[in-house]
């Protein structure tokens, strides 16, 4: 059973199989690819509110802190990602743990993550149609980032 | 021309053509999938150092700066990683952009991103023996984050 | 026509640091990585480092770690190397050569600047 | 890291000759071999990449072949402007290693 991996499926290693020789749960088990973010979620409530925790996973203790929001498309490898939400718009003070320091500004920073989408191969019809990988950037944000603020020049 | 995913090279959707058929040219053309790291760096030496710039890309900003090295295999997809190197032990203060705090943690976030490697498949061998894609998790730091000491209980 | 001009040749003493050019034209410089190779004695070649020009990234030879340091300046198509505490082993000939790309695979340094001569005296 | 070896440091042939230089590399490579030709000057030039593909505008009488840990590069009929120092460099890992070079010179 395999999938035709292509560029805007229309060339690259390729090979194709039928719906029908394809059951979603193996299509499934290959796009799970990464279904976690980075870090553990928080099993307490933390990371929701603009505050740093001294405890628990790393994006509730960040001065910058973020939750994350689960993305699932079934038809995409992976099918799961997870989007970074800043909390706070400036960074939290140290000291206090829940202050914000107008100093600072808590921002995302952004990746374009390649995914792969399942489409139907092209000139394919029917019942038995194949299907392609059809090759995508997809802008994901992995965190959020304390930073200071830019001075333009 | 296609390739076998697999995990562990012994399930999943599969595919698999002779080495002869695909040409590395081919195979790279996808495992090309992500070759940027998630910013662009500091034109400049800025993250080099332990300081937070006021200009420049978002990890030569943040009081918890890195810069990003290259983790490159051609039989990787995707071929190039980027792996984060924080710079600073402690977070740079926001006032001043140089001097560290000792009460924030410069500290990398980490992910188990999935990757596959071009693998010879079970019970092949000869010239023209094909190739799969065996799954893994790779361990890669995608940025350095600011955070308060655990504290323990 | 792709083309990497290098900097002069440089005469420096023992002990000081040094950065050579190297501008790129005929091409978008962000598109390709730059690599550098150093060439003593006329004869081996040994792979310094490389730099992709679009982000910074960059992946050093374990030899060069903390001799080499890799720039660019985006704004004038310029990659550099900075060489730190020279010695008489650093006296060579130290090339920029572009890294072939065909949109998806880096293959071969396809281009490569005339070489810079940094003789340590 | 990968050693590569040119077991022959230089070599003398005549005008017109078919001439081979080998490269071997400590381990298998994949095929992730490229050869590179430089001049008295200085001045170096990609010739093949990936074991046998010419890259633009190198003249056809240079070929490559291989596999595994041995690779070599032909000359099929040698010219005047192919008295050079060749090199083959190895892209299966990082560092990227070349061998020492392989000179050429007429008889």
């Known amino acids: 059973v395999s999938l035709r991996i292509q560029e805007g499926c229309s060339h690259l290693p390729s090979c194709c199989p039928s719906k029908e020789q394809e059951p979603p749960e193996e299509w499934l088990k290959w796009s799970s690819a990464s279904v976690s973010p980075p870090e553990p979620l928080s099993h307490t409530h933390h990371a929701e509110s603009c505050r740093a925790s001294k405890d628990g996973p790393l994006n509730s203790r960040a001065i910058s802190p973020w939750s994350y929001e689960l993305d699932r498309d079934l038809n995409r490898v992976p099918q799961d990602l997870y989007h970074a939400r800043c909390l706070c718009p400036h960074c939290v003070s140290l000291q206090t743990g829940s202050h914000m320091d107008p100093l600072g500004n808590s921002v995302p920073l952004y990746h374009n993550q390649t995914v792969f989408y399942r489409r139907p191969c092209h000139g394919e019809e029917g019942t038995h149609r194949r299907y392609c990988l059809e090759r995508r950037l997809y802008r994901v944000s992995l965190a959020c980032v304390c930073v200071r603020p830019r001075v333009m020049a | 021309v296609s390739l076998r995913i697999q995990e562990g090279c012994s399930h999943l959707p599969s595919c698999c053509p002779s080495k002869e058929q695909e040409p590395p040219e081919e195979w790279l053309k996808w495992s090309s999938a992500s070759v940027s790291p998630p910013e662009p760096l500091s034109h400049t030496h800025h993250a080099e150092s332990c300081r937070a710039s006021k200009d420049g890309p978002l990890n030569s900003r943040a009081i918890s700066p890195w810069s990003y090295e290259l983790d490159r295999d051609l039989n990787r997809v995707p071929q190039d990683l980027y792996h984060a190197r924080c710079l600073c032990p402690h977070c740079v203060s926001l006032q001043t952009g140089s001097h560290m705090d000792p009460l924030g943690n410069s500290v990398p976030l980490y992910h188990n991103q999935t990757v596959f490697y071009r693998r010879p498949c079970h019970g092949e061998e000869g010239t023209h023996r094909r190739y799969c894609l065996e799954r893994r998790l790779y361990r890669v730091s995608l940025a350095c984050v600011c955070v308060r000491p655990r504290v323990m209980a | 026509e792709v083309q990497l001009q290098q900097s002069g040749p440089e005469l420096v003493k023992p002990g000081a640091s040094m950065k050579i050019s190297c501008k790129a034209s005929?091409?978008?410089?962000?598109?390709?990585?730059m690599n550098w190779v150093k060439q003593s004695h006329g004869k081996n070649l040994e792979w310094i480092g490389l730099?992709?020009?679009?982000?910074?990234?960059?992946s050093y030879n374990q030899n060069f770690k903390g001799k080499a340091t890799l720039t660019v300046d985006k704004s004038s198509s310029t990659a550099y190397m900075e060489l730190l505490s020279l010695t008489s082993e650093d006296s060579a000939v130290y090339y920029c050569a572009r890294e072939g790309y065909d949109g998806y695979l880096y293959f071969a340094m396809d281009y490569w600047g005339q070489g810079t001569s940094v003789t340590v005296s | 890291d990968i050693q590569m070896t040119q077991t022959t440091s230089s070599l003398s042939a005549s005008l017109g000759d078919r001439v081979t230089i080998s490269c071997s590399a400590s381990?298998?490579?994949?095929?992730?071999l490229n050869w590179y030709q430089q001049k008295a000057d200085g001045t170096v030039e990609l010739l093949i990449y990936?074991?046998?593909s010419l890259h633009s505008g190198v003249p056809s009488r240079f070929s490559g072949s291989g596999s595994g840990t041995d690779y070599s590069l032909t000359i099929s009929n040698l010219e005047p402007e192919d008295i050079a120092t060749y090199y083959c460099?190895?892209?299966?890992?990082?560092?990227?290693?070349f061998g020492g070079g392989t000179k050429l010179e007429i008889k």
């Open positions: 990936y074991t046998s």
């Open positions: 460099q190895q892209y299966s890992k990082l560092p990227y290693t």
């Open positions: 005929g091409y978008s410089f962000t598109d390709y990585t």
């Open positions: 730099i992709n020009p679009y982000n910074g990234g960059t």
């Open positions: 381990q298998g490579i994949s095929n992730y």
